[in-house]
């Protein structure tokens, strides 16, 4: 059974992930971002279901494509280089989802824009955090 210390650690990691995803979204939605229209043309893939930490596998698999799109507006909109930002997220995701079980992600048929993709994972983090508190 999860201990209060492990729950607290999970909660902190989720909050960190949430902040990182929100920072990316804010950087993209920044009114000074001239690349937004172009960035919205890139397709991202969403999980059919995202209710448990193991479903973060679906986020992990889309992190590299996310980094490529962020590279297009790297210097003006983010405090960190996309490579470092995605690397930080990857570390948190790996810790949160665990490596004990190999989960095969199932994706929804319809694609999403980068904004929809980020909003989906922000909602996921908020939802899991709310169950822990």
């Amino acid at each position: 059974a999860p201990t209060s210390s492990s729950t607290k650690k999970t909660q902190l990691q989720l909050e960190h992930l949430l902040l990182d995803l929100q920072m990316i979204l804010n950087g993209i939605n920044n009114y000074k971002n001239p690349k937004l229209t172009r960035m919205l043309t890139f397709k991202f893939y969403m999980p059919k279901k995202a209710t448990e930490l193991k479903h973060l596998q679906c986020l992990e698999e889309e992190l590299k494509p996310l980094e490529e799109v962020l590279n297009l507006a790297q210097s003006k909109n983010f405090h960190l280089r996309p490579r470092d930002l995605i690397s930080n997220i990857n570390v948190i995701v790996l810790e949160l989802k665990g490596s004990e079980t190999t989960f095969m992600c199932e994706y929804a048929d319809e694609t999403a824009t980068i904004v929809e993709f980020l909003n989906r994972w922000i909602t996921f983090c908020q939802s899991i955090i709310s169950t822990l508190t």
Epitope: E61, K64, L72
Partner: antibody, heavy 121, light 113 residues
Framework: QVQLVQSGAEVKKPGSSVKVSCKAS????????IHWVRQAPGQGLEWMGW????????NYAQKFQGRVTLTADTSTSTAYMELSSLRSEDTAVYYC??????????????WGQGTLVTVSS | DIVMTQSPDSLAVSLGERATINCKSS????????????LAWYQQKPGQPPKLLIY???TGQSGVPDRFSGSGSGTDFTLTISSLQAEDVAVYYC?????????FGAGTKVEIK
Amino acid sequence: QVQLVQSGAEVKKPGSSVKVSCKASGYSITDYLIHWVRQAPGQGLEWMGWIDPEDGETNYAQKFQGRVTLTADTSTSTAYMELSSLRSEDTAVYYCARSLDYDPIYPFAYWGQGTLVTVSS
Amino acid sequence: DIVMTQSPDSLAVSLGERATINCKSSQSLLRNGNQKNYLAWYQQKPGQPPKLLIYYASTGQSGVPDRFSGSGSGTDFTLTISSLQAEDVAVYYCQQHYITPPTFGAGTKVEIK
């Protein structure tokens, strides 16, 4: 049709810089990234970086960071690659290339004819 | 960076025969979301820039003869020339177009036997 025309061959001394140009025609230069790839004599292909001519945003391969500068002049539809602190190992054919799509890592469908840069004392 | 390993280094094939080139990546090039493999093949003749033949592992570039085909998934890929023609003598390169930096194999030289 899409065309990328590069400047002529250069012979440079070690320690100096070289600036290669790539003039785009047949499309709007601001619609696609321009990549630079080099090929040493008898060797394989090595990606150096890309520039988005629309806003000058760049992304360089780590190996060339600090030594390569990519720029673009939208008024003349020309992209430039400047490589500094040249050494003999930089002797290569330098290509500019454009992909089929705006995607940063889409494969390169259009290539310049190449510019041979020879570094020799 | 993803390392691309091609084999063989060179290949001599009789006219009209099949030529097969292999390419292995150090990590998977399959994006699970769209089930696409981000691998391209190029042909380069002496004194010319590379020419894109295939991308997404098996999608032929417009205007490329259909004797050129690509296959494979994950980390193992193959370029096949079904019936070698004299004009196919060249060096062939694979390239991953999955993540920055895009990286190339060392090349395979195809000659007439």
